[in-house]
């Protein structure tokens, strides 16, 4: 069969080889398409409800005024010339529709290096067959599931027209120290060959490099965290970051129910105050960062220095926040 590719909505003429150019003609068109269940026969004398889809012209050709998705299939003509010689024509018709230019929607203006970011969503509307969307970085194809690249795709079909809408969401993890203004674009490749790809306008988000955080320092007074019963311990959380983050306190891995403050004072230490303390600095841009943990212990009379692995009580005694 001869392969014919026709654009949806356009007219199509299929020639019936060997047919006399004018009536009377002995010819018959048979079609097996999405509009038929088996073969539908159309003759020159026909003329009826099928004319809106396909009709035989006076010269024996089959005329499709506006091809649709349902017209994909096989078209055959059997004609006999004036001498009784029979000629057969056989066509395989496939249809296509080029969508509008794809677009990138919900595009990010800024990406953060070292973490996954949504770059944007590429949308193509009105294609047939569906075709595919692909992403490019600086003109080179991006391969999903490689080097921090992931793509989420969705294909929808219009219930009435049968045309496809494609969506592709791109996520990337920019490398630290990489290109500060990468260029992303997306292209639609048609499902039928011999049609060039359609490319979106490029987008150029900025890549923001988070400054490596300096460690959160926890300073204990007295040094070592060992104190006599009734003594005072002062814990100071030092964070070099600007603006100053919020500081919360933890004891034995559990947040203390206190308002944020960079200084924690434990006056009149008792057994219940023993335990492991740390502070957590929460930055608006980086999330939480925890200090090292320090152990606060009570020196019983006659003991020297901090006791290893001392067990703290559950109470907090009296706390003072600077």
């Amino acid at each position: 069969a001869q392969n014919i590719t026709a654009r949806i909505g356009e007219p199509l003429v299929l020639k019936c080889k060997g047919a006399p150019k004018k009536p009377p003609q002995r010819l018959e068109w048979k079609l097996n398409t999405g509009r038929t269940e088996a073969w539908k026969v159309l003759s020159p004398q026909g003329g009826g409800p099928w004319d809106s889809v396909a009709r035989v012209l006076p010269n024996g050709s089959l005329f499709l005024p506006a091809v649709g998705i349902q017209d994909e299939g096989i078209f055959r003509c059997q004609a006999m010339n004036r001498n009784g010689k029979e000629t057969k024509s056989n066509y395989r018709v496939r249809v296509y529709q080029i969508p509008g230019k794809p677009e990138i929607v919900d595009s990010a203006s800024e990406l953060t290096a070292g973490v996954p970011n949504k770059v944007g969503t590429c949308v193509s509307e009105g294609s047939y067959p569906a075709g595919t969307l692909s992403w490019h970085l600086d003109g080179k194809p991006l391969v999903p599931n490689e080097k921090g690249v992931s793509v989420k795709e969705q294909t929808r079909r219009h219930p009435e027209t049968g045309l496809f809408t494609l969506q592709s969401e791109l996520m990337v993890t920019p490398a630290r120290g990489g290109d500060p203004r990468p260029t992303f674009s997306c292209s639609f490749s048609p499902g039928l060959p011999r049609h060039r790809a359609l490319r979106t306008a490029p987008i150029q988000p900025r890549v923001w490099e988070p400054v490596p955080l300096e460690e959160v320092q926890l300073v204990v007074e007295p040094e070592g965290g060992a104190v006599a019963p009734g003594g005072t311990v002062t814990l100071t959380c030092e964070v070099p970051a600007q603006p100053s983050p919020q500081i919360h306190w933890m004891k034995d891995g559990v947040p203390l129910p206190l308002p944020p403050s960079p200084v924690l004072i434990l006056p009149e230490i008792g057994p219940q105050d023993q335990g492991t303390y740390s502070c957590v600095a929460t930055h608006s841009s980086h999330g939480p960062q925890e200090s090292r943990a320090v152990s606060i212990s009570i020196i019983e009379p006659g003991e020297e220095g901090p006791t290893a692995g001392s067990v703290g009580g559950s109470g907090l005694g009296t706390l003072a926040l600077a």
Partner: antibody, heavy 119, light 107 residues
Framework: EVQLVESGGGLVQPGGSLRLSCAAS????????MTWVRQAPGKGLEWVAS????????YYPDSVKDRFTISRDNAKNSLYLQMNSLRAEDTAVYYC????????????WGQGTLVTVSS | DIQMTQSPSSLSASVGDRVTITCRAS??????VNWFQQKPGKAPRRLIY???NLADGVPSRFSGSRSGTDFTLTISSLQPEDFATYYC?????????FGGGTKVEIK
């Protein structure tokens, strides 16, 4: 909302003429074939005429061929049926309907207009 | 010309009954058959298109099926508003041909 409204029916003598109209709204008129169907009193439905969307091609059953002419004015969203040489057996309610080809067949109908052929 | 032989021409049924109406085409018409409902003094209303598809706004108790050149309209559970006359139509070839109609009456 699709609406089809027929008009022009009435009493006419045998051999006389009548022109029916159908005003269409609520859809893109020139995208559809249009059809006239009639129903004699107490009887079933009978196809009368169809026309393609451009108006270039018209179709009739033998019972009305050469007597009835279907036409359309896409600019006015209107369908017409010119009936000549009327006979008593043409007495019926005449309905205008959208479609008539294999893509869309009579999915919306007007309320009908009565044509009575009698002396 | 294609003949559409519709049966029965009338039937009596009660609310809740399952009702089946058949049309047989005299030759192959593919899937190109519609079913219509008509109430006295009103225009026909399309129920089923292309043999098996339910038209917009039509209750799901109506269904259409096809076996070769035999087409069937089924009302799974007859409701009071379903008492009417039903017609099939073939639109594969001209002349477009309607079945003779089936009047569904209250038993």
């Amino acid at each position: 909302e699709v609406q089809l409204v027929e008009s022009g029916g009435g009493l006419v003598q045998p051999g006389g003429s009548l022109r029916l109209s159908c005003a269409a709204s609520g859809f893109t008129f020139n995208n559809y074939w249009m059809t006239w169907v009639r129903q004699a009193p107490g009887k079933g439905l009978e196809w009368v005429a169809s026309i393609d969307n451009s108006g270039d091609n018209t179709y009739y059953p033998d019972s009305v061929k050469d007597r009835f002419t279907i036409s359309r004015d896409n600019a006015k969203n209107s369908l017409y049926l010119q009936m000549n040489s009327l006979r008593a057996e043409d007495t019926a309610v005449y309905y205008c309907a959208r479609g008539g080809d294999i893509r869309v067949s009579l999915d919306h109908w007007g309320q009908g207009t009565l044509v009575t052929v009698s002396s | 010309d294609i003949q559409m032989t519709q049966s029965p021409s009338s039937l009596s049924a009660s609310v809740g009954d399952r009702v089946t109406i058949t049309c047989r085409a005299s030759q192959d018409v593919g899937i190109y058959v519609n079913w219509f409902q008509q109430k006295p003094g009103k225009a026909p209303r399309r129920l089923i298109y292309r043999a098996t598809n339910l038209a917009d706004g039509v209750p799901s108790r109506f269904s259409g099926s096809r076996s070769g050149t035999d087409f069937t309209l089924t009302i799974s559970s007859l409701q009071p508003e379903d008492f009417a006359t039903y017609y099939c139509l073939e639109f594969d070839e001209h002349p477009l041909t309607f079945g003779g109609g089936t009047k569904v009456e209250i038993k």
